[in-house]
């Protein structure tokens, strides 16, 4: 059986300030069981953008219904984009663990750039 892959099809996305940005991510398998998270940045200081399991992310919506039984689409949309949102976003799969989930695989990242709001 092939190991799960995390696919972020776009290397980069450009969005005008004030618009929403869609960041696409898909899994190739339902296994292993565990949540996905979106981060900005790849280092120790990476910022949590969305956690499937818990948390409050008022500007983030999921593109598809993540609780659907066979869902493999973990794309998100971030509303009201500002220049401060620029950066590289990573979709990361975690394997369910006890007590803590363990990072399993990361997508290659999507760089979000923000254009000036059209006048």
């Amino acid at each position: 059986e092939d190991e799960l892959q995390v696919i972020q099809p776009e290397k980069s996305v450009s969005v005008a300030a004030g618009e929403s940005a869609t960041l696409r991510c898909a899994m190739t398998s339902l296994i292993p069981v565990g949540p996905i998270m979106w981060f900005r940045g790849a280092g120790a200081g990476r910022e949590l953008i969305y956690n499937q399991k818990e948390g409050h992310f008022p500007r983030v919506t999921t593109v598809s219904e993540l609780t659907k039984r066979n869902n493999l689409d973990f794309s998100i949309s971030i509303s009201n984009i500002t220049p401060a949102d620029a950066g590289t976003y990573y979709c990361v799969k975690f394997r369910k663990g006890s007590p803590d989930d363990v990072e399993f695989k990361s997508g290659a990242g999507t760089e979000l750039s923000v254009r000036a709001k059209p006048s």
Epitope: G41, G43, G45, E47, L48, I49, G87
Partner: antibody
Framework: DVQLVESGGGLVRPGESLRLSCAAS????????VTWVRQAPGEGLEWVSL???????YYADSVKGRFTISRDNSKSTLYLQMNGLRAEDTAVYYC???????????WGLGTLVTVSS | EIVLTQSPGTLSVSPGERATFSCRAS??????LAWYQQKPGQAPRLLIY???TRATGIPARFSGSRSGTEFTLTISSLQSEDFAVYYC??????????FGGGTKVEIK
């Protein structure tokens, strides 16, 4: 406004323990890594420890095995448990918020730890 | 561990003059270098990251540049509030996050 307030510093003897706290407000604590940086009297800055958003911990070699960083997301509070304290641990301890660029954009005012017999 | 060496240790400058000081990394850090300002009795304040990007609210008189592993912070026209100690920090993806020893900018 982002605020970080450290507490728990004080005077202890070598070998003793102390637990520092850092209460955070003004940002979504769960979404950011947080860190401790210290400054010995009249000296420069020294990075001590960092805890990521997923709870992964990192330490400077000088404190590894003696200090433990932790976070309580429900209380928006960062901790530093310091055991086996030495005279060279005497410093002002600052907590700071970490950006995704791995820089420290907001700092507390610090709490002084003095280790002396 | 990456060692950052700042020079000079102390810089004496008159208000209104230009101040330039440097930070050299012992190995490559790309552009992952930040600058902080610290005044007596205060916490450090982030000025510059990624070698030349000003942090939010930092005046345009502060600028950073890079040439290989040598980084420079320039204050184009020193104001009274700029007299302080300046530290560089490498901010590559993974710890340890080392700081330089600092440069004290004092009034001439």
């Amino acid at each position: 406004d982002v605020q970080l307030v450290e507490s728990g510093g004080g005077l202890v003897r070598p070998g003793e323990s102390l637990r520092l706290s850092c209460a955070a407000s003004g940002f979504t604590f769960t979404n950011y890594a947080v860190t401790w940086v210290r400054q010995a009297p009249g000296e420069g800055l020294e990075w001590v420890s960092l805890i990521s958003v997923t709870g992964t911990t990192y330490y400077a070699d000088s404190v590894k095995g003696r200090f433990t960083i932790s976070r309580d997301n429900s209380k928006s509070t960062l901790y530093l448990q310091m055991n086996g304290l030495r005279a060279e641990d005497t410093a002002v301890y600052y907590c700071a918020k970490v950006t995704w660029k791995n820089v420290f954009d907001y700092w507390g005012l610090g709490t002084l730890v003095t280790v002396s017999s | 561990e990456i060692v950052l060496t700042q020079s000079p240790g102390t810089l004496s400058v008159s208000p209104g003059e230009r101040a330039t000081f440097s930070c050299r990394a012992s190995q490559t850090v790309g552009s992952k270098l930040a600058w902080y300002q610290q005044k007596p009795g205060q916490a450090p304040r982030l000025l510059i990251y990624d070698a030349n990007t000003r942090a939010t609210g930092i005046p345009a008189r502060f600028s950073g540049s890079r040439s290989g592993t040598e980084f420079t912070l320039t204050i184009s026209s020193l104001q009274s509030e700029d007299f302080a100690v300046y530290y560089c920090q490498q901010h590559t993806d993974w710890p340890p996050y080392t700081f330089g020893g600092g440069t004290k900018v004092e009034i001439k």
